[in-house]
């Protein structure tokens, strides 16, 4: 149940998909990945104010308790709701293989 | 792939399951839930240092990019990996019903 999609903090400030360009070196992959040399990493970044894109009942509880006990209970966090698959050309003991990873790139985001 | 379970920040400081006692009033449920009057809410709280309980490849990427660009990319976040179901006795138009919720109580935690 993704509750609200209106961000009360202003445009682009709340939990949403961002793209970050990263090299194999940035990712620490240079020793085992041959291609791509650079990845457009999609990730979930932004604030999770009250009921914004609440993933489930747990997220709603977290919002309520954070309001009551902000020092004890953190606000919900912006994380992937689903992923886009991606292939990597990776080194193997004998050469290379094309491997699919289902959990690399965020597809959309929610707060939990 | 839950990488490390050793917390480099000291015992209890990293992402783990916590229990927070909350009343129906705390949760904003008093108008639609009859029982329980109080809930032992299990939730995921704590830091996610490098590779600690990394949920997947995305979490590992996030760790690497946070190290490089801490102002742009946040560290992974401590969220539920799974949930325990819970029943609520809730008010209905005609009386009460016993309803099971599968996404209320965190069962275990990981970093993502």
């Amino acid at each position: 149940a993704r509750n609200g999609d209106h961000c009360p903090l202003g445009p682009g400030r709340c939990c949403r998909l961002h793209t970050v360009r990263a090299s194999l070196e940035d990712l620490g992959w240079a020793d085992w990945v041959l291609s791509p040399r650079e990845v457009q990493v999609t990730m979930c970044i932004g604030a999770c104010p009250s009921q914004f894109r609440a993933a489930n009942m747990h997220a709603q509880i977290k919002t309520s308790l954070h309001r009551l006990k902000p020092d004890t209970v953190p606000a919900p966090c912006c994380v992937p709701a689903s992923y886009n698959p991606m292939v990597l050309i990776q080194k193997t003991d004998t050469g290379v293989s094309l491997q699919t990873y289902d959990d690399l790139l965020a597809k959309d985001c929610h707060c939990i | 792939a839950r990488n490390g379970d050793h917390c480099p920040l000291g015992p209890g400081r990293c992402c783990r399951l916590h229990t927070v006692r909350a009343s129906l009033e705390d949760l904003g449920w008093a108008d639609w839930v009859l029982s329980p009057r109080e809930v032992q809410v299990t939730m995921c709280i704590g830091a996610c240092p490098s590779q600690f309980r990394a949920a997947n490849m995305h979490a590992q990427i996030k760790t690497s990019l946070h190290r490089l660009k801490p102002d742009t990319v946040p560290a992974p976040c401590c969220v539920p990996a799974s949930y325990n179901p819970m029943v609520l006795i809730q008010k209905t138009d005609t009386g009460v019903s016993l309803q099971t919720y599968d996404d209320l109580l965190a069962k275990d935690c990981h970093c993502i």
Epitope: V87, L88, V96, L105 | -
Partner: antibody
Amino acid sequence: QVTLLESGGGLVQPGGSLRLSCSFSGFSLSTYGIGVGWIRQAPGKGLEWLAHIWWNNNKYFNTALKSRLTISKDTSKNTVYLQMNSVRAEDTAVYYCARMGYDIMDYWGQGTTVTVSS
Amino acid sequence: DIVMTQSPATLSTSPGERATLSCKASQDVNTAVAWYQQKPGQAPRFLIYSSSYRYTGVPARFSGSGSGTEFTFTISSLQSEDFAVYYCQQHYSTPWTFGGGTKVEIK
């Protein structure tokens, strides 16, 4: 497992156009890094790369043939199409499609034969 | 466009022998050269990526080397099933281009 199957070949009149289809299974064209390419081989000759299309709809074409080629995809149908206009006798060839992962062309179809003749 | 030139056009040799094929690029392509095998009536089979990396399932008797403009493909000990046409291809930049092929035939 990965399979590709070309169709749409046959006899084409000079000056006409051809539309080839490549139906595939075992992979998805919505996967980052995946593409489908077209390569042809004239009778008794070598291989000639024609075009390819990526998961993000980026397209690349053989320089000499660019003006005559169109490539498109239907991700939901797992199909890639190649259209060639103003065909001539020298376009007679076996046309292959291949699965691509970045710059790897690792799986190929068995090819469809196109004959340009009046 | 980058021109890939293979030599020899035909290599006549015997089973058990070593076969060495050459491929030259018209400009520097770093290590971005692939090799394919094609048998009559069949589609090409992908063998070598980025000059020297064998693809999954390719036997160890196939190997590649080189960088810049000069590349070599070697079959250490020819098996009967290895007699075929071999193509090099540059994957450094589009348009991707193939060499003319080397036919490895039984002597």
